[in-house]
């Protein structure tokens, strides 16, 4: 079975995921966006796709390079880097993205429900959209034997990059880097994207989708998750950063809003796009770290404030134990610090992708739908892509995040790793992704990054009454985004924070949903290798900073079913903003310790610049998933 | 920094054409969008169209939409606004924008291109 | 126009004051305000849920609901007497919206 998990188009460019994990060739990622009736976009349409608000926190293949778009700097995420970011020394399989001419000229995140140019063949291909919703259906794209029956699964990458783009500069990158709005955005919204304005729809949707007599199943999840991890700028704000131990390949697109303090974030658009395999840096799916993370990006970060869905409040802690790199995305902090209004073009060689975007176990959350019906929260189903970010405005009444919604994990959440995980170039432990040094990108993206989890130990969450709760926020967008689970038995969402980028501008029904992972760690998991456990939600604060409230989610473990239920308690807050971290886009937490600078003329549109916070490791697949506390 | 920067007042007779830019610097000129507002004197502001320069996709506001003309010239840097045939109603202050990736925000302006059209 | 403001508020020096923009797409976008003073060109000064640009003083802020978009300016100075401006997408989203204008007299 091959699921997968596709963003919003951005100007006709989307991302996709294989199987919740770096794993695709370049010759697969053609065949992939063939059948998709699409191309591997060229640098141009990505750049263009980026002006609109498409950022992923995932390497993936376009025309000739691996990269990944960057709009707000995140230390996890082509190392703080913004721009199109490539990847020069590519020597593994990635995500791929894609370009479909036919699609609107801003963001679509209208669902996708088949591979129109699939062929005949045996393999059960589930394509998961970011409002979860899922379409199956039988056939093959590959064409490449090798792709098929790979003879090394795990780090076969067929990807190219030209050696000529590689910066001569240490560290190998070439930074096309753009500049950046005003860099410093307000304290109220760290998690803020500019890429969106979207209001996020603030309901977060149990779906339980009903299979169509068809083969083709649709199945929306709740938008809980996108909502936790958008960015201000959509009104609604999913505050619970919380990442679910199931990565899934899913990154939550939908922006969210985590208050209206968090300003920017909605008009980032949260193109999350995959499931946050990248280097965590843009997903908020590893972002989520049992530690409190002091976040002060509030104030520095407003504009930023895609990923926290309470970006503005340091204390908001996430308590999931899966890394909270992506989180900060929007770091006001890292906006400030990071953003350069007069940045370089977008074009950015990154020499190592491993030390940041090496996947990084994204928190998959595995709703169960309430009840059969397909419901998308209030929200509109229309994803603005990537990252909800077309900003589904909650109001602030939405901003409450109803975050009442229940995230059930089943018994076996506490094992999100226990997916195998290939160790992988990319691949380094939770602990190297802390060293800077080692990964001054957030080297254990893969590892950490995302969490492989059983069907049994995807956390399901149960949309509560409270139609909030699945609020994601887009920059532009001020309506809430729902979430959809994935309700597929190992189907867990991943969050990206590229995704979450909130995007007000277009208002869509986001869900996390993510293709079956069963890697944790970031990287390509070895689905034989089993990773350590995390319990996943360990309980986090949220903060609404409009509603002035924090909320704290404890895990409550359902009698009935085993699952992990969130429970609210609101605690009065001014202004408290979910930890920033948890936009993917802010860069305030650099998990290498250093930030990275995109350095170059502004003539050329070309900066040269190595990592400073460290040097580039492509040190290997020291998989081990340690989740830091 | 970032700047855009427009060209001067200019002072038409109607039925002239004409033709008003907006250099771009500080940042990847090709990589934003590029806005243009019409500010009609005592009015308020009026979004006419935008351009992306990277590929010269460009969008135009029902209400402009075949009145005016937008293009850029990506190899200096440059938006355009043009008329063919100017109108004493096209008097008014233009200002150029640059589109915030993602949203419809505009974060930098022009200082504005003052048109006079009068016979 | 789809945006619609008042025309003109006022207020007095260090009060605190709201201005306020109506419009159907304000339910799914976020709003973004400009300032613009005699003679010059608009400044952005909030965009998205409430994020202010650098340089922007935090007695302005932002926020959202329903169909409205409001700009809070706590403890207005001399200053900030201008006119404001709300922009957003359109209903079809492909298109920017500006309201007309709301001229801020600080007493």
């Known amino acids: 079975q091959i699921d997968l998990n596709i963003t919003c188009r951005f100007a006709g460019v989307f991302h996709v995921e294989k199987n919740g994990r770096y794993s695709i060739s370049r010759t697969e990622a053609a065949d992939l966006c063939k059948a998709f009736n699409s191309t591997l976009p060229t640098m141009a349409q990505m750049e263009k796709a980026l002006s609109i608000g498409f950022e992923t926190c995932r390497y993936g293949f376009i025309e000739g390079h691996v990269v990944i778009p960057r709009i707000h700097p995140n230390s996890i995420c082509a190392a703080n880097n913004t721009g199109v970011y490539i990847l020069t020394s590519n020597t593994s399989q990635y995500d791929t993205y894609c370009f479909n001419a036919s699609a609107p000229p801003e963001e679509d995140c209208t669902s996708v429900t088949d591979l129109p140019n699939a062929f005949d063949g045996p393999i059960t291909i589930t394509i998961v959209n970011r409002d979860g919703t899922r379409y199956v259906q039988k056939g093959e794209y590959r064409t490449n034997p090798e792709d098929i029956y790979p003879s090394n699964p795990t780090d076969d990458d067929v990807s190219s990059g030209s050696s000529s783009e590689r910066s001569s500069t240490s560290g190998g990158y070439i930074f096309y880097t753009f500049s950046t709005v005003h860099p410093i955005p307000d304290e109220d919204s760290p998690w803020i994207t500019d890429s969106t304005d979207r209001i996020p729809a603030t309901t977060l949707m149990s779906t339980s989708a009903t299979a169509t007599e068809t083969a083709t199943k649709r199945q929306e999840t709740w938008d809980w998750f996108s909502w936790l991890f958008l960015p201000s700028e959509s009104k609604n704000h999913l505050h619970t950063t919380t990442q679910m131990a199931g990565t899934s390949s899913n990154t939550i697109s939908a922006g969210w809003e985590p208050n209206e303090e968090n300003e920017d974030e909605r008009d980032r658009h949260l193109s999350f796009s995959g499931s946050g395999i990248d280097d965590d840096e843009d997903f908020i799916s590893s972002t989520i770290s049992t530690t409190p993370r002091a976040f002060d990006h509030t104030k520095q970060n407003q504009d930023w404030t895609q990923w926290n869905p309470s970006h503005s409040n340091p204390e908001v802690l996430l308590q999931t134990t899966t890394r909270m790199t992506d989180v900060d995305r929007n770091g006001t902090t890292a906006y400030e610090g990071n953003w350069n209004p007069e940045a370089h073009p977008p074009l950015i060689h990154h020499e190592h992708h491993e030390e940041e975007e090496t996947p990084h176990s994204t928190s998959t959350i595995q709703a169960t739908p309430s009840s059969t019906t397909e419901e998308t929260a209030t929200q509109k189903e229309q994803w603005f892509g990537n990252r909800w970010h077309e900003g589904y405005r909650q109001t602030p009444k939405e901003d409450s995040h109803s975050t009442t919604g229940t995230a059930a994990a089943s018994a076996h959440t506490s094992h999100p790793m226990q997916g195998r995980t290939t160790p992988s170039p990319e691949d380094s432990s939770w602990t190297d992704f802390f060293n800077p040094i080692s990964h001054p990108m957030g080297r254990g993206h893969q590892a950490g990054r995302r969490m492989d989890m059983d069907s049994s130990h995807s956390i399901t969450l149960q949309p509560t009454a409270n139609p909030n709760t699945g609020l994601v926020e887009d920059l532009d967008r001020t309506g809430p985004l729902s979430m959809t689970t994935q309700q597929s038995n190992s189907q867990s969402f991943s969050t990206s924070h590229e995704g979450l980028e909130e995007d007000k501008d277009h208002p869509t029904t986001s869900t996390l949903t993510s293709s079956n992972r069963n890697d944790v760690t970031g990287g390509r998991r070895d689905p034989n290798h089993s990773e350590g456990s995390t319990t996943l939600l360990e309980g986090y604060t949220s903060h609404y900073p409009h509603t002035k409230e924090s909320r704290t989610f404890i895990p409550v473990t359902s009698a009935k079913t085993g699952s992990f239920g969130v429970t609210a308690v609101t605690v009065g807050d001014s202004n408290s903003n979910v930890n920033r971290s948890l936009s993917g886009d802010q860069d305030t937490f650099h998990p290498s310790g250093g930030s990275h600078t995109t350095h170059g003329s502004e003539s050329d549109g070309h900066s040269h610049g190595s990592q400073e916070g460290g040097a580039n490791t492509t040190s290997g697949p020291i998989r081990t998933p340690q989740i830091p506390e | 920094q970032v700047q855009l920067v427009q060209s001067g007042a200019e002072v038409k007779k109607p039925g002239e054409s004409l033709k008003i830019s907006c250099k771009g610097s500080?940042?990847?000129?090709?990589?934003?969008?590029i806005g243009w507002v019409r500010q009609m004197p005592g009015k308020g502001l009026e979004w006419m169209g935008i351009?992306?320069?990277?590929?010269?996709?460009?969008r135009y506001s029902p209400s402009f939409q075949g009145q005016v003309t937008i293009s850029a010239d990506k190899s200096i840097s440059t938006a355009y606004l043009q008329w063919s045939s100017l109108k004493a109603s096209d008097t008014a202050m233009y200002y150029c924008?640059?589109?915030?990736?993602?949203?419809?925000?505009?974060?930098?302006w022009g200082q504005g291109t003052l048109v006079t059209v009068s016979s | 126009s789809e945006l619609t403001q008042d025309p003109a508020v006022s207020v007095a020096l260090g009060q605190t004051v709201r201005i306020t923009c109506q419009g159907d797409?304000?339910?799914?976008?976020?709003a973004s305000w400009y300032q613009q003073k005699p003679g010059q060109a608009p400044l952005l000064v909030i965009y998205?849920?409430?994020i202010r640009p650098s340089g922007i003083p935090d007695r302005f802020s932002g926020s959202s609901s329903g169909n409205t978009a409001s700009l809070t300016i706590t403890g207005a100075q001399a200053e900030d007497e201008a006119d404001y401006y709300c922009n957003s997408r359109d209903s079809s989203g492909n298109h920017v919206v500006f309201g007309g204008g709301t001229k801020l007299t600080v007493l």
């Open positions: 351009i992306y320069p990277g590929d010269s996709d460009t």
């Open positions: 924008a640059r589109r915030l990736h993602g949203p419809f925000y505009f974060d930098y």
């Open positions: 998205g849920k409430n």
């Open positions: 797409s304000l339910r799914s976008y976020y």
């Open positions: 500080g940042y990847s000129f090709t990589s934003y969008w």
